[in-house]
Interface confidence: low
């Protein structure tokens, strides 16, 4: 009599979550009779899977018609699939007694349930920190089995070092999530920096998920400021420059000064950038020297995104100049189109 | 018939120890997941712990380094080793089996009272 | 962990009456959740397993459906017997946990 084989074609299938795997059987004999039944795992604690003779398996479907004698197929349809799933399943026969006795059990078949982790999303500081500041970032990905996964971190194509990562839950789960904290020092140039969280995962075909964060949202640059006193013009005008560079982001308020008061108020707006993507703005005020007796203090107060003002103070001489008898203005624009310069300077 | 039964439940001490003991009937009890539920008087289920076929065991966060859950297969038997008992742990024990395809809850035993007061 | 919530805590209703008590997983718990009925001064019994399969010997007017995070359990004709309190309880990871409880109540 020939032997009886329980045979399991495929070693290994692999299905993704939510889809149904399809686990192949054949026995070569019907003889002797008795139930085939489904393990996952192997040993005393295996887990009943299916039992063709017998209980509820909401889950589990036979591929072939159990209940015809000629049936040969004892393949299974499990639905549904998560990654509670994954094992290997063993295909058993057994002769019908009490209790049934275990004849021959197939070489199993491993299910592996691939999960795809969703899209990293990448996040950075509530509030702007300046240069030679560590500033952390955090991703987050969701959703993936198995637990087995790899994240990188990146800032203009480096990749970074300083960086944690957890992946939760520690124990076995349905599926896994991962969050990463990356620290990163802040430079002047960095307006235009990127941060790049990259996930590998079996699921992913070697084709990473990545999130990304511009480090402009993080980056506050200061501005260098510069006042400077152009030469005398023949109307006893002094053309005096508050030069305000390498400012991010460009939300900048200026104020000039005449002797302690506001002389004029200006917003910067639709600056044009810096290769670096900062911005520089420069504004003048002309002084009538004739108006004035004494020399005059003249401060370029400068207030950039909501931080403390900065000034810088210049004081004009007019002790050498002849005095214009009968005028009495302080100081003079010289219309709203001269009030600013941009600086071209990159 | 398949059956759990429950014992060893009682009036102990706060800080004392008891053990309680399930025996099954019916089934083999290594080839189930098996739980303990508790119900305090008047209040809803909780569960308590849980071991596996492989002898994997899990425990709820305020009973871990104080409960130990164990079975003989010999004797067909869980049990529940209760140490540092607390009067939040005053409750009705049930012992649980899970079921052989995915852990539901099938078969419960009628369930031991533990009352921890001095 | 996951947190499980029934409502309503409890309802009246009469005999013959259809009811529905819902339950709600903070997380997606895909389908396994049981609902399990106890009467004063007994054991929980179980109805329902993988949200929608009776346990065997259940009688078919206890019905449950639901996946994901949302469930329910309906009672069709509610007779005399029916009248206890009911418990949903998620069962895809460890800490298992249960409901509140909605207690069923003759009007």
């Known amino acids: 009599e020939e032997e009886l084989q329980v045979i399991q074609p495929e070693k290994s299938v692999s299905v993704a979550a939510g889809d149904s795997a399809t686990l192949n059987c054949t026995v070569s004999s019907l003889i002797p009779v008795g139930p085939i039944q489904w393990f996952r795992g192997a040993g005393p604690g295996r887990e009943l899977i299916y039992n063709l003779k017998e209980g509820h398996f909401p889950r589990v479907t036979p591929v072939s018609d159990p209940t015809k004698r000629n049936n040969m197929d004892f393949s299974i349809r499990i639905s549904n699939i998560t990654p509670a799933d994954a094992g290997t399943y063993y295909c058993v026969k057994f002769r019908k007694g009490s209790p049934d006795v275990e004849l021959k059990s197939g070489a199993g078949t491993e299910l592996s349930v691939r999960a795809k982790p969703s899209a990293p999303v990448v996040s950075g500081p509530a509030v702007r920190a300046t240069a030679e500041h560590t500033v952390s970032f955090t991703c987050e990905s969701h959703g993936f089995s198995p637990r087995d996964i790899t994240l990188k971190w990146f800032k203009n194509g480096n990749e970074l070092s300083d960086f944690q990562t957890n992946v939760d839950p520690a124990g076995k789960s349905v599926s896994y999530s991962i969050r990463s904290t990356a620290r990163v020092v802040l430079t002047r140039r960095d307006v235009h920096s990127q941060v790049i969280c990259e996930v590998a995962h079996v699921t992913l075909q070697g084709d990473p998920l990545r999130g990304t964060a511009n480090l402009s949202e993080a980056i506050r640059v200061p501005p260098f400021l510069e006042v400077t006193q152009q030469s005398m013009r023949a109307d006893n005008q002094v053309n005096v420059t508050c030069q305000v560079t390498k400012f991010y982001p460009q939300r900048l308020q200026l104020t000039w000064l005449e002797n302690g008061n506001v002389s004029r108020t200006e917003m910067a707006s639709a600056l044009p950038e810096n290769k670096d993507g900062t911005y520089n703005w420069t504004s003048w005020l002309l002084v009538n020297v004739s108006a004035h007796r004494d020399d005059v203090k003249l401060t370029c107060q400068v207030e950039h995104d909501g931080q403390p003002a900065v000034n810088k103070s210049f004081s004009v001489k007019v002790s050498a100049h002849p005095k214009e008898q009968g005028s009495n203005t302080a100081a003079e624009n010289t219309g709203t189109n001269e009030r600013n310069i941009y600086g071209g300077s990159g | 018939e398949v059956q759990l039964v429950e014992s060893g439940g009682g009036l102990v001490q706060p800080g004392g120890s008891l053990r309680l003991s399930c025996a099954a009937s019916?089934?083999?009890?290594?080839?189930?997941?098996m739980h303990w539920v508790r119900q305090a008087p008047g209040k809803g289920l909780e569960w308590v712990s849980a071991i596996g076929t492989a002898g994997d065991t899990y425990y709820t966060g305020s009973v871990k380094g104080r409960f130990t859950i164990s079975r003989e297969n010999a004797k067909n038997s869980l049990y529940l080793q209760m140490n540092s008992l607390r009067a939040a742990d005053t409750a009705v024990y049930y012992c649980?089996?899970?079921?052989?395809?995915?852990?539901?809850?099938?078969?419960w035993g009628q369930g031991t009272m533990v009352t921890v007061s001095s | 962990d996951i947190q499980m919530t029934q409502s309503p805590s409890s309802l009246s209703a009469s005999v013959g009456d259809r009811v529905t008590i819902t339950c709600r997983a903070s997380q997606d718990i895909n389908n396994y959740l049981a609902w399990f009925q106890q009467k004063p001064g007994k054991a929980p019994k179980s109805l329902i397993y993988t949200a929608s399969s009776l346990h065997s010997g259940v009688p078919s007017k206890f019905s449950g459906s639901g996946s994901g995070t949302d469930f329910t359990l309906t009672i069709s004709s509610l007779q005399p017997e029916d009248f206890a309190t009911y418990y949903c309880?998620?069962?895809?990871?460890?800490?298992?946990?249960f409901g509140q409880g909605t207690k069923l109540e003759i009007k």
């Open positions: 309880q998620q069962y895809v990871s460890y800490p298992y946990t």
């Open positions: 649980v089996r899970g079921g052989v395809w995915d852990d539901a809850f099938d078969i």
């Open positions: 019916g089934f083999t009890l290594s080839s189930y997941d």
